[in-house]
């Protein structure tokens, strides 16, 4: 006999990285017929939704109008059909950005390199932080962590045309509070013609949307819950 229901999906719209004082919606998708959803924050019950009519609804949304460091952290949700509860969702790490200062991102030997060259990014922030994050813009939101007193280095190793794209970095004051983003650095990797044609660039965010980390449905990421969860979890573990 089944003791629990399948876990729901949890994600944030427009993104799990939320500039302070901006809005975000936490979405929890369970099953049609669920009579109650519970959103938990840092292990404690945060909010409850009892959708009506339950047989016509399989997703609820919890709106945060004004993101701040108190609202940043780990969220999960569960749902109930009759008296049977689901497994908890994966953890959603909600991050507040645009805190305090702006780091500087540089790249060595330079932003234009040849395939096979070793490339290292340097992220520098003079205020009190020891963790840095390097993000490559694009659908899969590649993220690397680095550590250092005022600067972290991110060696990419010998690069290929797949490394082409726009990078930014953040200083992290804790797992869920990040600095303003650095100015973008566009890495151009030239290779032979054949390699270039076989390695299309990730679709990047339009410049204006990256400014507020708005992932629109055009990127496809919101629709791909598994990828969304995977990206968010790997980022902060």
């Amino acid at each position: 006999q089944q003791q629990t229901l399948p876990k729901p999906f949890i994600w944030a719209e427009p993104h799990f990285m939320v500039p302070k004082e901006k809005q975000v919606t936490i979405c929890c998708q369970g099953n049609y017929g669920a009579v109650e959803y519970q959103l938990h924050f840092e292990g404690s019950l945060f909010a409850v939704d009892r959708p009506k009519p339950p047989e016509r609804i399989n997703k609820v949304q919890f709106y945060i109008p004004d993101m701040n460091s108190r609202m940043a952290g780990q969220y999960s949700c569960i749902y109930r059909v009759g008296e049977l509860w689901s497994e908890p969702s994966n953890l959603l790490d909600l991050v507040v950005t645009e805190m305090y200062d702006t780091p500087t991102l540089s790249v060595h030997p330079g932003p234009e390199v040849i395939s096979g060259e070793k490339v290292t990014f340097y992220c520098r922030l003079d205020t009190a932080t020891s963790m840095f994050l390097l993000l490559k813009e694009g659908r899969s939101s590649h993220v690397q962590r680095g550590y250092g007193k005022v600067q972290a280095e991110f060696p990419l190793g010998p690069v290929t045309t797949a490394h082409r794209g726009t990078y930014r970095c953040f200083g992290s004051y804790n797992n869920h509070a990040w600095s303003f983003p650095s100015e973008p650095v566009k890495l151009l990797v030239t290779g032979d013609i054949e390699n270039t044609s076989l390695a299309p660039e990730d679709p990047t965010f339009p410049a204006d949307t990256w400014g507020t980390y708005l992932l629109t449905t055009e990127t496809g990421l919101q629709k791909d819950h598994a990828l969304w969860d995977h990206t968010a979890q790997n980022l902060l573990r």
Epitope: F46, A47, R70
Partner: nanobody
Framework: QVQLVESGGGLVQAGDSLRLSCVAS????????MGWFRQAPGKEREFVAA????????YYADSVKGRFTISRDNAKNTVYLQMNSLKPEDTAVYYC????????????????????WGQGTQVTVSS
């Protein structure tokens, strides 16, 4: 912006009943989810009960379930907390809270969920 004013507190004996009221200013009361919290001396403020905008959803802390009832009258801009079978451990300052961003079927349980708070009304239950 909404202002919340609680009333109805007082000193009662264990086993007695009290009804707390919270009146909200403004014409948009029906768009707010409402909650009651309480804070005993030297303790954290804790969730008691909450009610959604249209009263479709109510939710209670385990410690008051079956004894307390939350209700609202949108025409009177008022939310109520009917407290029966009071116990000495119910002694606390009771606060009313409002959130303007909930859906019709949603309530908040965490303090950080709520935007607006009243000043509180004291409830003392003697044994």
């Amino acid at each position: 912006q909404v202002q919340l004013v609680e009333s109805g507190g007082g000193l009662v004996q264990a086993g007695d009943s009290l009804r707390l009221s919270c009146v909200a200013s403004g014409r948009t009361f029906s768009t707010y989810a409402m909650g009651w919290f309480r804070q005993a001396p030297g303790k954290e403020r804790e969730f008691v009960a909450a009610i959604s905008r249209n009263a479709d959803t109510t939710y209670y802390a385990d410690s008051v379930k079956g004894r307390f009832t939350i209700s609202r009258d949108n025409a009177k801009n008022t939310v109520y907390l009917q407290m029966n079978s009071l116990k000495p451990e119910d002694t606390a300052v009771y606060y009313c809270a409002a959130d303007r961003y909930s859906s019709n079927t949603q309530v908040g349980v965490a303090r950080t969920y709520y935007d607006y708070w009243g000043q509180g009304t004291q409830v003392t239950v003697s044994s």
